[in-house]
Each structure stands twice: as C-alpha cells, then as structure tokens.
Interface confidence: low
C-alpha cells in the first residue's frame, strides 16, 4: 500500500504537514520494495499541463508512474477535488505549491484506495481534509493559498488505471486559525480538534479528558454540553457519529438519512423497503410479514386462490368477482379472522391474535418491549423498566447499597466511575481508567508528557 510514502527520508522535518528542507536531487524515497530510488527518475511521469478549475481532466496512468498537472490559484480558497478511479486502483495524490511534488516532498497528500469504502489517512498531520470514497468517486477539500499548485497522481497499483479529476471552488467554507495545526477538522471556520488536542487552533496536546472536555461525566456516562454528542462528547452536533452512516445512508445536518431498507440512528438496522408493508403486514427483521390474503415483498399483492370459495367464510359475488364476508371475517378472500382487539399500527391480526412487529408486545401490540433482563428485577411498563426496591439502572440490573451493607449491589453505584458487574459470587465495580477502590472512588495519579 501507500503507507510507505508517509515515512520521510531522514534529515527533514515536518511543520504543519509540510516537508521542509531544501529540495535536491539527492532526495530519495523508500520504495515498497525497500530499496532507495533517486527522485530524478526519467520517464516516470506524464505531464498534462495546467488544469482549469471546474473542468474534468482524464488520464490513463501506468503502474509506478506519476501523472502531473498544475492549478493556478489567484486568491486563497477552499478547493474541492472530485477524483474518479477504478475500484481496484491504489493512488497517492500529492499537492505542492510552486514545485512538483515527490513521494518525499509535498504540502498535502491523500491516499486513495478504490477497495475501501471510505478512507482517511490516520496520521494527525494528514487528517486535515475529510476524504470519502463512494463507489469510484473520491472527494476531499483543501485550502490552497495564492500560487501555482502542482498535482501528482501516483499509481501504486499493478495495473494501468484510468483516473479523472475536477476541482470546484467552495465559497461557504471559512478558513480556520492556522488550519487547526493539522490536529483538527475545520468546520465553518471553527476547529473541531481530534482526540488528544485542545484549543481554538488545536495546538495544545492534552491528557485524555473525560467526555473530551465537552461534557459532564455522571453515573458512568457522559452528559454532553450543547453542541456535542457521542459517547465521549467528541462529535459536533452538525456531524454524524458514524460519518458513513453504516454505508447505508447520508449524513445531513448531523443526522443519518437512511437509504431504503435501513433504519436506526446510524442506519445500522435492516428495515423493510416499505416499512408500512403496504398497510397489509408488519416489518419484522427487515422482512414484511403479510396479513393473510396478501403477498409480495411489500405485501402489495392480493393473493387468493379460488376466490369463489371465499375461504369458506363468505359469499362469492360473481358480478364483481368479490367476496362478501361473514361476520368476524374480512379481506378480499375472507381469510382474515377479525381479532377481538384492534392490533393497531404495530401488529397484524393472524389467526384471531395480534402478531406484533419488532419492539412491540401485548395483546394489542400497543406496549413497547423492554430489555429481556428487565423482568429479573423489575416490571416492564410500556418500554420503561420499573425497578423493584434495591435495584436501579435502565434495565434494573444494578443493585443498590442498603444501610451501608453490600447486598446485591455495588458500593455507591461505583460512584459513576465504573461499571457494576456480577462476579463469581458478588457484585463488584470494574473501574474506569484513572479510578480504583472497591467503589471506584479513589482517583489515580496519571502522568502526561505534554
């Protein structure tokens, strides 16, 4: 892969992701084979000249070859790069102002792997740009200052690949202070720092902070401050916890809008293509369970054999080819027995009883299901687990200390600094990092080399 390119040759340092030091012909790059190859290789690049912003350029690139072009930036701006490549392609995209980039000399570098659904180069200095790969289209955004910028697409695969790209100027993106030092993501002019970094410009390294410094730690979970979300309060409200929405949706204003057939906060659950099942069934585990008399993927097909018999529960009307059903029977073929209760919107009547969709229970499918463990120490009341004396927690699985003795619970509920679990013989606290003691109430010293 291209990870070998991220390790610079000795003798140069990086500042904000920019390779410094004088370029020279003695620059070398460590190639995948492990050997050193002089940068001044002949016949190893294709130059297509200056590319116009907004116009798509296409080039076939042999393996091990750079395709080079230039873009002239007349005023500082955010530029969105749309790059199309084959599904098995592996490319490195190098961008450098003023001079042609090499494996070792560049201002920005992106790694594009056609096999990956989405890819972000993991080293903090490279994570300044968001990069997504949908099918064969990669998109990333870079802030480019005035000047002539040189692009180089390096084919790190085994085969010739057809590559094309175009660039679009983004007006709405504002610049961030010092480009977040490469330690954060710039969103509308505000730095959202990656874990381990703090400050308006993400310049300060930080010790691990509970709730990322963006929330209050309480009872084992983070209560996020306004504008933040996620288990660690590390995701801005206008972003999605899973930016790819499980590969089954799009992130819009911080919420996943799921593709047909998927649901859930992160589009991680399989849903029916028509969640209503055409009003003739219920959706269970992503499949429509149809009411009698109905069939098809979405219960959209009226299914009857020999309707003139009306399932033995009605009278056939030959003039219209329809059944007039006996009392307590319904449906086009009188095959649906009327339930004694209305199954509502979360169930269908099958054989005189309500069959509930996922997450619902009760004779009329009108009660939300609780976690199966709720019944151990509580009672389920419409999706909420009401705990018996001495128990608490969402599913009534956490015992409470009574009169200073440890009965079936943990000391002081682990003080919110641990998880209460049932060991071999008793309940005990499993403390979070930085806490110890039977009740996780003793803070441990931690040393941070800032």
């Amino acid at each position: 892969g291209l990870n070998w390119q991220l390790q610079p040759a000795d003798g140069h340092t990086f500042n904000n992701g920019i390779r410094t030091g004088l370029p020279g012909n003695d620059d070398v790059a460590t190639m995948p084979s492990g050997g050193k190859v002089p940068w001044s290789l002949k016949n190893s690049s294709i130059d297509s000249g200056e590319a116009e912003v907004g116009r798509r350029v296409t080039q076939e690139v042999p393996p091990g070859v750079f395709w080079r072009s230039q873009i002239h930036i007349s005023q500082p701006q955010f530029l969105k790069f749309n790059i199309s490549l084959g599904k098995d392609a592996l490319f490195g995209v190098y961008i450098r102002r003023g001079l042609p980039p090499s494996h070792a000399q560049y201002d920005f570098m992106e790694r594009l792997d056609g096999k990956e659904k989405w890819s972000v180069v993991e080293s903090p200095r490279e994570r300044r740009s968001i990069q997504t790969l949908v099918q064969n289209e990669a998109v990333f955004v870079q802030y480019l200052d005035v000047g002539l910028w040189h692009l180089a697409f390096y084919n790190d695969g085994k085969d010739k690949e057809m590559v094309s790209f175009n660039t679009v100027v983004l007006d709405s993106v504002q610049d961030c202070p010092r480009n977040c030092h490469g330690n954060g993501e710039c969103v509308s002019g505000v730095c959202h720092c990656f874990p381990g970094f703090l400050g308006a410009d993400c310049a300060k390294a930080a010790c691990p902070v509970l709730c990322s410094g963006n929330g209050q730690y309480s009872k084992g979970t983070c209560q996020c401050y306004s504008g933040w979300k996620g288990a660690e309060c590390d995701v801005p409200m206008n972003q999605c916890i899973d930016p790819s929405c499980g590969g089954h949706g799009s992130c819009i204003d911080g919420n996943c809008v799921c593709s047909a057939g998927y649901k859930g906060e992160h589009c991680e659950e399989v849903d029916c293509l028509d969640p209503t099942c055409s009003s003739h069934g219920v959706c269970v585990n992503g499949e429509c369970l149809c009411s009698p008399g109905w069939g098809g993927l979405n219960c959209e097909l009226a299914r009857v054999q020999c309707p003139d018999q009306c399932s033995g529960h009605g009278t056939y009307l030959p003039d219209t080819g329809l059944c007039s059903c006996d009392p307590n029977w319904m449906g086009p073929d009188c095959s649906v027995e009327v339930c004694s209760v209305d199954c509502g919107t979360h169930g269908v009547c099958i054989g005189g009883a309500c069959r509930c969709e996922e997450g619902w229970t009760g004779a009329a499918c009108d009660q939300r299901v609780c976690h199966p463990r709720c019944i151990e120490h509580g009672t389920c009341k419409d999706g909420k687990c009401e705990c018996r004396e001495g128990w608490n927690g969402e599913h009534c699985t956490i015992g409470r200390q009574t009169a200073g003795t440890e009965t079936d619970g943990c000391p002081d509920l682990c003080n919110g600094n641990g998880r209460c679990t049932l060991g071999q013989n008793s309940w005990q606290c499993v403390c979070q990092t930085g806490w110890r003691g039977p009740g996780c109430n003793v803070a441990m010293e931690t040393s941070c080399a800032d």
Epitope: S279, H280, G295, L301, A302, R303, V304, Q305, C306, P307, D308, G314, T320, G321, L322, C323, S324, C325, M330, G331, P332, D333, C334
Partner: antibody, heavy 127, light 108 residues
Framework: QVQLQESGPGLVKPSETLSLTCTVS????????WSWIRQPPGKGLEWIGY???????NYNPSLKSRVTISVDTSKNQFSLKLSSVTAADTAVYYC?????????????????????WGQGTTVTVSS | EIVLTQFPGTLSLSPGESAPLSCRAS???????LVWYQQKPGQAPRLLIY???SRATGIPDRFSVSGSGTDFTLTISRLEPEDFAVYYC?????????FGPGTKVDIK
C-alpha cells in the same frame, strides 16, 4: 346494485377544512377498498387516496400531510377531510369503490379498478 | 411516482372509424395494473378495461387493449355515437395511483 352518494358543503373558505362523506347503499362497505378522486374544472383526474373497510389507508403523497380518510362501517359511510384548503383544491370530488379481483385458479394475478362511482360533488374554495 | 402521458390530446373521428388511444408510462407497468376509464361531460368516469384485457360489466367487445411495459393502446374498433367522450388510463403499479391527462375523442 351498489350506489355511492357524496355529500358535504359546496363552498369552503381558504385555510379551512373540506369535509365530505360518501354513503354506500345497496351493499356492504365490507371487503372493499373505497377511494376519493378529484377533478379540477376542465382538468384530469387526481387520486386522493383509499381506505380499506378495516381502516387501513393509502394516500397520495402530494396531499398526505393534509388528507384524512376514515370509515364508519356501522353507517356504511366513508369520509374525506382535506385541511388548509386553497383555491387549487376547487374541484369535483368523487368517491368510488376500488375493487381487488383475483380471478379463480390464478394465484398472483390481482386486478384493480374503480367499478362504482358517485356522481361527484362540486367543492369551491373561495372567501 | 409513475407519470402517464396520453396522446393525442384530441382525436377527431367519424362514427364507424377506428380510434387508437395511446398511454405511455414513465416507467414499466404490468399490463394487469393498467386500467382505462371513459368519462362523458357532466358524468363520473366509468370503468372500461381492467386486468390487462378484462372488460367491465356492459362494455362491448369493440373496446380492446394492447401493449406492455411502458406503451399501451386502447383501441375502439368501430366508433359508435355513444363512444365520443374523454378516455383516461390509470396505473396501479405503484402508489400514488396516477391517471393520464386524458384523450378526447370527438366527432369530426
């Protein structure tokens, strides 16, 4: 012989709710679908939605936020409510029986069609 | 939604002539999901053909339907005076169940 009769006010003020009732006579409302269709002056037909006698509904998405179709099997009636009306809702409103016929000895052929219609009622939206 | 287009908009013919009325769908529709109606001035529409080729009660055999996929034709083989009206196609292939704009058959 099944017959349908629409009833309701012929004049509705803008932003108010249009309410129409369709009375089914000469047969039972059970075991059928019942539809509402409208036709603006000099224009074509627009399907509004249907209700199954058990209460299941299906609405035209373009009107879904404003439309409610309900059924009263005891009165052999079904009704249409269209909220927040504007002049664009001026039309002849028809109720119809929407059959689902599955011919004998054919499992998957399901035939549809509105075989019985009311004579229509004109609704004008104006202040 | 499936958009139905009907053409011609108006067909001027004499009694006894044949009238081909076209209905085109924006996406494929099963022939059994296409329905045809006839509407005369001041009257409600009347079901003509349903289920590919089934004629509704009382509809004479001079009315027939052909076609599949996206292109369908209602043919009135010998126009009678009572056949001059507006004809609508409607699809039940997917909700919403849309109608075509209609074709008016009038006397030349």
């Amino acid at each position: 012989q099944v017959q349908l009769q629409e009833s309701g006010p012929g004049l509705v003020k803008p932003s108010e709710t249009l309410s129409l009732t369709c009375t089914v006579s000469g047969g039972s409302i059970s075991s059928y679908y019942w539809s509402w269709i409208r036709q603006p002056p000099g224009k074509g037909l627009e399907w509004i939605g249907y209700i199954y006698y058990s209460g299941n509904t299906n609405y035209n998405p373009s009107l879904k936020s404003r439309v409610t179709i309900s059924v009263d099997t005891s009165k052999n009636q079904f009704s249409l409510k269209l909220s927040s009306v504007t002049a664009a809702d001026t039309a002849v409103y028809y109720c119809a029986r929407d059959i689902v016929v599955v011919p004998a000895a054919r499992d998957y052929d399901y035939y549809y069609g509105m075989d019985v219609w009311g004579q229509g009622t004109t609704v004008t939206v104006s202040s | 939604e499936i958009v139905l287009t009907q053409f011609p908009g108006t067909l001027s013919l004499s009694p006894g002539e044949s009238a081909p009325l076209s209905c085109r769908a924006s996406q494929s529709v099963s022939s059994i999901d296409l329905v045809w109606y006839q509407q005369k001035p001041g009257q409600a529409p009347r079901l003509l053909i349903y289920g590919a080729s089934s004629r509704a009660t009382g509809i004479p055999d001079r009315f027939s339907v052909s076609g599949s996929g996206t292109d369908f034709t209602l043919t009135i083989s010998r126009l009678e005076p009572e056949d001059f009206a507006v004809y609508y196609c409607q699809q039940y292939g997917s909700s919403p169940f849309t109608f075509g704009p209609g074709t008016k058959v009038d006397i030349k």
